[in-house]
């Protein structure tokens, strides 16, 4: 297992609709053809794999399971979007990148993006 640098923004503010997007960029030391990206949430004394995707370079990301994430890739960058967030989901979201094929296997873990989510204020009742 070889180490690899992964960069991601320090802070992102989710939209009023609970959507947060950020870029995860990795310094690929070679020509990887199969890449796995995992988003980890570290908060509340827990570590949670929020979503994970494997993709072949140049193809769309295919996310595992009941994913609340979507994403696209471009070169050594992955554009990740997490949906359905609420204030309680505020936390540190860490990008983990694995170069699966061809060997050797590379692993990189970013420092994390602090995502802040603010629940929208309910609209006041109106007679109009």
């Amino acid at each position: 297992c070889k180490a690899m640098h992964v960069a991601q923004p320090a802070v992102v503010l989710a939209s009023s609709r609970g959507i947060a997007s950020f870029v995860c960029e990795y310094a690929s030391p070679g020509k990887a053809t199969e890449v796995r990206v995992t988003v980890l949430r570290q908060a509340d004394s827990q570590v949670t794999e929020v979503c994970a995707a494997t993709y072949m370079m140049g193809n769309e990301l295919t996310f595992l399971d009941d994913s609340i994430c979507t994403g696209t890739s471009s070169g050594n960058q992955v554009n990740l979007t997490i949906q359905g967030l609420r204030a309680m989901d505020t936390g540190l979201y860490i990008c983990k990148v694995e170069l699966m094929y061809p060997p050797p296997y590379y692993l990189g873990i970013g420092n994390g993006t602090q995502i802040y989510v603010i629940d929208p204020e309910p609209c006041p009742d109106s007679d109009f």
């Epitope: 949430r41 949670t48 794999e49 929020v50 595992l64 399971d65 609340i68 309680m88 989901d89």
Partner: nanobody, 125 residues
Framework: EVQLVESGGGLVQTGGSLRLSCAAS????????MGWFRQAPGKDREFVAA????????SYADSVKGRFTISRDNAKKMAYLQMNSLKLEDTAVYYC??????????????????WGQGTQVTVSS
């Protein structure tokens, strides 16, 4: 709801290992996120680990990360908790639970509506 029965608990020495099993019956097992919780004497029930419906995504409490591994076998309707490097503070009754919801960011807070009866794990020095 699903019916859940845990097994595999027991007495083990510090540093030892145990594998807990959770057998499900009833509804379609693969529709449920599965979790493990524990309750030590005189303490509140606490989250240990959870696993998504297909088994591809997992969540762990910081206190067990790197020592415990959660897994599942949908064909057998089973969930498992492999516990290694056990510590005295891991002593508790361990419960498996099922939540009829998709994955998310905070599986410890999912609406687990089915619970097993629990299995005792005692770690001694």
């Amino acid at each position: 709801e699903v019916q859940l029965v845990e097994s595999g608990g027991g007495l083990v020495q510090t540093g030892g290992s145990l594998r807990l099993s959770c057998a499900a019956s009833g509804r379609t097992f693969s529709n449920y996120t599965m979790g493990w919780f524990r309750q030590a004497p005189g303490k509140d029930r606490e989250f240990v680990a959870a696993i998504s419906r297909s088994g591809g995504l997992k969540s762990y409490a910081d206190s067990v990360k790197g020592r415990f591994t959660i897994s599942r076998d949908n064909a057998k309707k089973m969930a498992y908790l492999q516990m290694n490097s056990l510590k005295l503070e891991d002593t508790a009754v361990y419960y498996c639970a099922a939540a009829p919801v998709p994955w998310g960011t905070r599986p410890s807070t999912f609406p687990y509506d089915s619970w097993g009866q629990g299995t005792q794990v005692t770690v001694s020095s």
